[in-house]
């Protein structure tokens, strides 16, 4: 597993470093999760040919993965810090069930999958501290999540490989958009 944020070996080059600010810590946490996703994607791509599948073919899946839209206030035009932060936190909470699904999908990267899941929980906590309007954040229904998880795990092998690939790709894209938006806050 990669080195957790705050223990980055690269930091050695910067002595007398002040403690990380909240924004820097969040930035670093996202980078850490992206590293984990990268490792998981490597295993997925080595195992199947999903990574070569065209975006059009992949778009036909029926997964309801979180995605940034104009109305979420995370883009430059119509940027709204509060609306956007709510979207990021809500999106990450929605991704949690999919990250749970990933837990039994990896052989050599099992530890990495767990690290991505746990690091995302930490990221959510960081962001919740930053949010002023926590009431606007809707937590996914546990019963709905449980039945979704059962449904995903009951798919055939090909669909499970496809689902794994889609989750990793969508999560990476969501984090990249979140990273840019958070730098605007």
């Amino acid at each position: 597993a990669p080195v957790p944020p705050g223990e980055d070996s690269k930091d050695v080059a910067a002595p007398h470093r002040q403690p990380l600010t909240s924004s820097e810590r969040i930035d670093k946490q996202i980078r850490y999760i992206l590293d984990g996703i990268s490792a998981l994607r490597k295993e997925t791509c080595n195992k199947s040919n999903m990574c070569e599948s065209s975006k059009e073919a992949l778009a036909e899946n029926n997964l309801n993965l979180p995605k940034m839209a104009e109305k979420d206030g995370c883009f430059q035009s119509g940027f709204n810090e509060e609306t956007c932060l709510v979207k990021i936190i809500t999106g990450l909470l929605e991704f949690e069930v999919y990250l749970e699904y990933l837990q039994n999908r990896f052989e050599s990267s099992e530890e990495q999958a767990r690290a991505v899941q746990m690091s995302t929980k930490v990221l959510i906590q960081f962001l919740q501290k930053k949010a002023k309007n926590l009431d606007a954040i809707t937590t996914p229904d546990p019963t709905t999540n449980a039945s979704l998880l059962t449904k995903l795990q009951a798919q055939n092998q090909w669909l499970q490989d496809m689902t794994t690939h889609l989750i990793l790709r969508s999560f990476k894209e969501f984090l990249q958009s979140s990273l840019r938006a958070l730098r605007q806050m």
């Epitope: 690269k10 930091d11 080059a13 910067a14 470093r17 990380l20 600010t21 924004s23 820097e24 930035d27 670093k28 996202i30 980078r31 992206l34 590293d35 996703i37 990268s38 940034m68 883009f75 430059q76 035009s77 990476k172 894209e173 990249q176 958009s177 990273l179 840019r180 730098r183 605007q184």
Partner: antibody, heavy 126, light 110 residues
Framework: EVQLVESGPALVKPTQTLTLTCTFS??????????VSWIRQPPGKALEWLAR???????FYTPSLKTRLTISRDTSKNQVVLIMTNMDPVDTATYYC??????????????????WGQGTMVTVSS | EIVLTQSPATLSVSPGERVTLSCRDS???????LAWYQQKSGQAPRLLIY???NRATGIPARFSGGGSGTDFTLTISSLEPEDFAVYYC???????????FGQGTKVEIK
């Protein structure tokens, strides 16, 4: 190999509109985290960032020139275009396009310009 | 508006010497947005350091970056003849991503 090449007129008259094109190869601007910016440098002076366009077509401009600038892209041609209206002699500079730093292994992007074009000199004079 | 101050404006040094360039800003900036560039006469700038202390691809180990808050440094441990150039620091301020560049430090042969 990643490359960026700027093209446009060497000379424009005051009040005219400048159109610059950045043609790139070796990467796709649709890749998550990818971004191309325009930066200029008047002769003997420091660098000045102008505009940026991101992987999902989100656009950013330097506040002082926002009303004069338009950045756009053509992903099929691998090009980014900058339009700057109402040119003035103070806009005489070398104009560069640059790709933002992205760690290709994980898609993490840093706010730094990793790869630059060679630049194109634009003189504003009547 | 945040202003980046680079010092000194010019530095006269001999090859083999250790050089430390300073970049100071009027407000505290994020370490994830501080970068250093090298520009030789008639050429485009080249990224040396990003995120305060990470060396860009292909940059020799003699270049290192550090600092936090309002004070950042670029150190060249032992100056090579090809290192004589102008060095710029840059960072991002609000509204994001407003890139601000310093005025540059010229490193010339003594």
């Amino acid at each position: 190999e990643v490359q960026l090449v700027e093209s446009g007129p060497a000379l424009v008259k005051p009040t005219q509109t400048l159109t610059l094109t950045c043609t790139f190869s070796g990467f796709s601007l649709s890749t998550g985290g990818m971004s191309v910016s325009w930066i200029r440098q008047p002769p003997g002076k420091a660098l000045e960032w102008l505009a940026r366009i991101d992987w999902d077509d989100d656009k950013f401009y330097t506040p002082s020139l926002k009303t004069r600038l338009t950045i756009s892209r053509d992903t099929s041609k691998n090009q980014v275009v900058l339009i700057m209206t109402n040119m003035d002699p103070v806009d005489t500079a070398t104009y560069y396009c640059a790709r933002m730093h992205i760690d290709d292994s994980n898609g993490y992007f840093s706010d730094a310009f990793h790869i630059w074009g060679q630049g194109t000199m634009v003189t504003v004079s009547s | 508006e945040i202003v980046l101050t680079q010092s000194p404006a010019t530095l006269s040094v001999s090859p083999g010497e250790r050089v430390t360039l300073s970049c100071r800003d009027s407000q505290s900036v994020s370490s994830t947005s501080l970068a250093w560039y090298q520009q030789k006469s008639g050429q485009a700038p080249r990224l040396l350091i990003y995120d305060t202390s990470n060396r860009a691809t292909g940059i020799p180990a003699r270049f290192s970056g550090g600092g936090s808050g309002t004070d950042f440094t670029l150190t060249i441990s032992s100056l090579e003849p090809e290192d004589f150039a102008v060095y710029y620091c840059s960072f991002v301020s609000r509204p994001y991503p407003r890139f601000t560049f310093g005025q540059g430090t010229k490193v010339e042969i003594k």
